[in-house]
């Protein structure tokens, strides 16, 4: 008969598995089976026989099963024996990859690849790869004192970089056992790399401030950089140093704060690999009451005005007020307190009010004092410009600039300007022995010229109190200069002429230079020398003139600076008439008498009088003086016809007389032939 085993000669079993060894016979109907180990160790298994088959089952397989198992089959008197070598190994699990911590960019990390419960571990090889790059390979050839299942590890330290994100770590374990066809000789583990950045640059922003008032609110916002994005945790440091967790939000808002909320608040940015904290100290102050004094810390008050100082309290429901001066002089003002306001009215403000006034507010046990300095000034009106007289070209004049009721005097400056030019400047720096309102003046003398006309004379007064707030600190008065020029170059234009015919019209126009423009006054000189006013117009017009209009006319240019005259003689000519031709003493005289022949034209001045003696041989023009011709010792030949012609531009008139000269001898009249 024959004996067969399954497996035939060798069985490679994994520790912990169930192993069945089968022994069967052919050619023997009822064989007897027995199993033993080659060194007669315990079987550590269970035998089941069924017909021509016997099975040895070992469950679970362990080191105690690593033997050569012999199956003996007895058929009647014949024995057959066959052995199966059971060899054991252990490689039950895939490797495990462990990191010494999260992968933090730039920080070395140790990767450990562990293969658990390996036997025999001197046949183990572990490779560690990052992507396609082999980082380390190791064989475990170290010696041991016995067969055992051990966990074998390979360690590599490397520094991750951001570029490693997404790469994989591969741990590959190989157990080099000959003829191990039926089991995997290679196992591997894969871990995807996630590179982290530990939280850093943790920043806290506090709004409105780290110093807060009781009852107020604060919002604190915290941010931290890292990968993955850090979670934000807020806590407060307790007195014992421990942290009291407050919030897991980036923003922490505290409302209706109390003093006990003061302290150090900690914001911590936390992610898988680290934490980074920032602290901020909040100070919650007891809600203070505040005192405001208005109009401000100092007030400039004009003497005589009314001033109201107001003391206002915030943050106190029922304050009590008191006012005093810094030197505890009398208040000399009216106090009125109502609710959270108190007013001190000084009216009218006088020198006794020039103090620092203190408002003391009491709220519960707390007192607050606020001061206001009342500074006085007086500068009520613009300067007054006065001149000693009118401005006359070339004549000196005294200008006075007066600033009334000034205080403080030692800060006053007066400046006199003509156009852009400073004429005079004075500062009143003298000390005064008492506070008083003073009138201050600047006086100066100057000689105006025509060119000054139109220029501005400015008196500027400045009160140099820069630290006082009042308006204006500068006052000025302006006067435009008009320099008077006495009339001159007075001229008269007569149209059509100063000599004219009776009945015609005449225009006499008077022109006079001066400033202000001279006033024109026409008059006529009367025979007695007096002047008869005629007109105040520049042009004097006479219509339908009569001879009696002839005469001396006077034009006068008058202004504040003086007067200037111009005379013009007007001659009104008429046709000569009323000619009288007389002989004196008679028209009949004796030879040897003196005879005056006189021709007068009474109505017309400026006529030509021509005396002629008529004769057949021709007229003889006699030399007359003012129309009179004197014949001394008349002779007979002087008898005859005498003719007078009164002649002017307008016309002429003739008169004639016959002179009779009687001879003394014959007493004959001699008449000149006609």
């Amino acid at each position: 008969f024959k004996i067969e085993t399954t497996p035939e000669s060798r069985y490679l079993a994994q520790i912990g598995d169930s192993v069945s060894l089968t022994c069967s016979t052919t050619g023997c109907e009822s064989p007897f089976f027995s199993w033993r180990t080659q060194i007669d160790s315990p079987l550590n298994g269970k035998v089941t026989n069924e017909g021509t088959t016997s099975t040895l089952t070992m469950n679970p397989v362990s080191f105690g099963n690593e033997h050569s198992y012999l199956c003996t089959a007895t058929c009647e008197s014949r024995k057959l024996e066959k052995g199966i070598q059971v060899e054991i190994y252990s490689f039950p699990k895939d490797p495990e990859i462990h990191l010494s911590g999260p992968l933090e960019a730039g920080k070395p990390i140790t990767v450990k690849c562990s293969v658990a419960d390996v036997y025999p571990f001197d046949r183990l090889e572990i490779d560690l790869l990052k992507g396609d790059h082999l980082m380390k390979s190791q064989e475990f050839l170290e010696d041991a004192d016995r067969k055992s299942l051990e966990t074998k590890s390979l360690e590599v330290t490397f520094t991750p970089v951001i570029e490693d994100i997404g790469k994989v770590l591969v741990c590959r374990a190989k157990l080099h056992i000959d003829e191990m066809d039926s089991v995997p000789t290679v196992r591997q583990a894969v871990k995807e790399l996630q590179v982290y950045i530990s939280p850093k640059n943790t920043v806290i922003s506090v709004n409105p401030s780290t110093k807060l008032q009781e009852g107020g609110s604060v919002t604190m916002t915290c941010s931290s950089e890292g990968l993955p994005a850090p979670e934000i945790f807020w806590s407060k440091k307790l007195d014992n140093g421990n942290l009291q967790h407050l919030s897991g939000n980036a923003t922490l808002t505290l409302i209706a704060m109390r003093m006990e909320d003061s302290g150090i608040y900690v914001c911590e940015g936390v992610n898988l690999i680290g934490k980074n904290r920032k602290e901020v100290e909040l100070i919650v102050q007891e809600k203070p009451f505040t005192v405001e004094i208005s109009p401000g810390p100092r007030i400039a008050a004009q003497i005589g005005d009314s001033v109201m100082l107001t003391c206002s309290v915030m943050g106190c429901e029922s304050p009590s007020f008191s006012w005093r001066t810094q030197i505890d002089s009398p208040l000399s003002g009216k106090v009125r307190s109502e609710g959270t306001n108190s007013t001190l009215t000084l009216s009218p403000v006088s020198f006794e009010n020039e103090h620092s006034y203190l408002c003391t507010v009491t709220c519960g046990h707390k007192k607050l004092e606020k001061g206001i300095q009342v500074e006085l000034y007086s500068f009520p009106r613009d300067p007054e410009i006065e001149m000693s007289g009118g401005l006359v070209n070339g004549s000196s004049v005294t200008v006075s600039c007066k600033v009334p009721s000034v205080y403080p005097l030692d800060r006053l400056e007066i400046e006199l300007l003509k156009g852009e030019t400073i004429l005079e400047n004075i500062e009143f720096l003298e000390d005064t022995d008492m506070k008083s309102l003073e009138n201050k003046s600047l006086e100066m003398t100057f000689i105006p010229t025509i060119e000054d006309t139109g220029k501005a004379l400015v008196c500027q007064a400045k009160l140099h109190i820069d630290d006082m707030e009042f308006e204006p600190k500068q006052r000025q008065s302006t006067q435009t200069l008009y320099v008077n020029v006495a009339p001159r170059d007075t001229t008269v234009l007569v149209s059509p002429s100063s000599i004219l015919e009776e009945g015609s019209s005449v225009n006499m126009t008077c022109l006079s230079q001066g400033f202000p423009a001279p006033k024109i006054l026409w008059s006529r000189q009367l025979p007695n020398g007096e002047l008869q006013p005629l007109s105040e117009n520049a042009t004097l017009t006479l219509i339908s003139t009569k001879m009696e209009d002839s005469g001396v006319y006077l034009c006068e240019g008058i202004n504040q600076a003086g007067r200037s005259r111009k005379e013009v003689e007007l001659i009104i000519q008429v046709t000569p008439k009323d000619i009288k031709l007389t002989a004196f003493p008679s028209e009949s005289v004796k030879e040897g008498d003196t005879v005056i022949i006189s021709c007068t034209c009474g109505n017309v001045p400026e006529t030509w009088i021509i005396l002629k003696k008529k004769a057949e041989t021709g007229d003889t023009v006699l030399k007359s003086i003012d129309g009179a011709y004197t014949i001394r010792k008349a002779q007979l030949k002087d008898a005859g016809v005498y003719e007078c012609e009164s002649k002017n531009k307008v016309g002429s008139q003739l008169r004639s007389l016959t002179l009779d000269v009687q001879g003394r001898e014959n007493n004959k009249d001699y008449f000149s032939p006609e």
Epitope: D145, K147, S148
Partner: antibody
Framework: EVQLVESGGGLVKPGGSLKLSCAAS????????MSWVRQSPEKRLEWVAE????????HYAATVTGRFTISRDNVKNTLYLEMSSLRSEDTAMYYC??????WGQGTLVTVSA | DVVLTQIPSTLSVTFGQPASISCKAS???????????FNWLLQRPGQSPKRLIY???KLDSGVPDRFTGSGSGTDFTLKISRVEAEDLGVYYC?????????FGGGTRLEIK
């Protein structure tokens, strides 16, 4: 420095139970097979039980199989031996060992009526 | 189970003299992988056992080179070239090839 410290020994009546502990430090506990070995009052050494590094596999001496249980906690780095149905022949100094290279100082178990 | 027999059970020596301890196994301790898991331990008075030699002849770190291990199959020997005071105690052999692991009965080394 490798250190193994046993505890839990004491006097127990036959049939009673005890649980021994061994606290390990100074090495990667989870990588090694750990054993319990006992030394009788007559100073004979006997291997009792062992547990694989991962804790999946246990082996026992025939004399204790079914009565003793070996276990480990790789987080706490502690090895245990739970003993029940104790007999007088179990009286011994029980040592915790890594391989047989490192041994603890031992804990004495006395089983006596 | 594999039985390990140690000879002698007590060994009296003089300081500075050599000493030799023998250990015989009931079957070969050669493993199929070619290794012999045979070891020597020393238990000094009042102390825990301590491994001296593993895999027949390999000295553990810190063990003086006056100790030598030898042998194969079933016969193994531990030799001390010059005995010193710190060598006194009980020497045990033990095997880790065949399950269950077993120990020898021990040899006490003492001073004459």
């Amino acid at each position: 420095e490798v250190q193994l410290v046993e505890s839990g020994g004491g006097l127990v009546k036959p049939g009673g139970s005890l649980k021994l502990s061994c606290a390990a430090s100074g090495f990667t506990f989870s990588s090694y097979t750990m054993s319990w070995v006992r030394q009788s009052p007559e100073k004979r050494l006997e291997w009792v039980a062992e547990i694989s590094s991962g804790g999946s596999y246990t082996h026992y001496a025939a004399t204790v199989t079914g009565r003793f249980t070996i276990s480990r906690d790789n987080v706490k780095n502690t090895l245990y031996l739970e003993m029940s149905s104790l007999r007088s022949e179990d009286t011994a100094m029980y040592y915790c060992a890594r391989g047989e290279l490192y041994w603890g100082q031992g804990t004495l178990v006395t089983v006596s009526a | 189970d594999v039985v390990l027999t140690q000879i002698p059970s007590t060994l009296s020596v003089t300081f500075g003299q050599p000493a030799s301890i023998s250990c015989k196994a009931s079957q070969s301790l050669l493993d199929r992988g070619g290794k012999t898991f045979f070891n020597w331990l020393l238990q000094r008075p009042g102390q825990s056992p301590k491994r001296l030699i593993y895999l027949v002849s390999k000295l553990d770190s810190g063990v003086p080179d006056r100790f030598t291990g030898s042998g194969s199959g079933t016969d193994f020997t531990l030799k001390i070239s010059r005995v010193e005071a710190e060598d006194l105690g009980v020497y045990y052999c033990w095997q880790g090839t065949h399950f269950p692991w077993t120990f020898g009965g021990g040899t006490r080394l003492e001073i004459k």
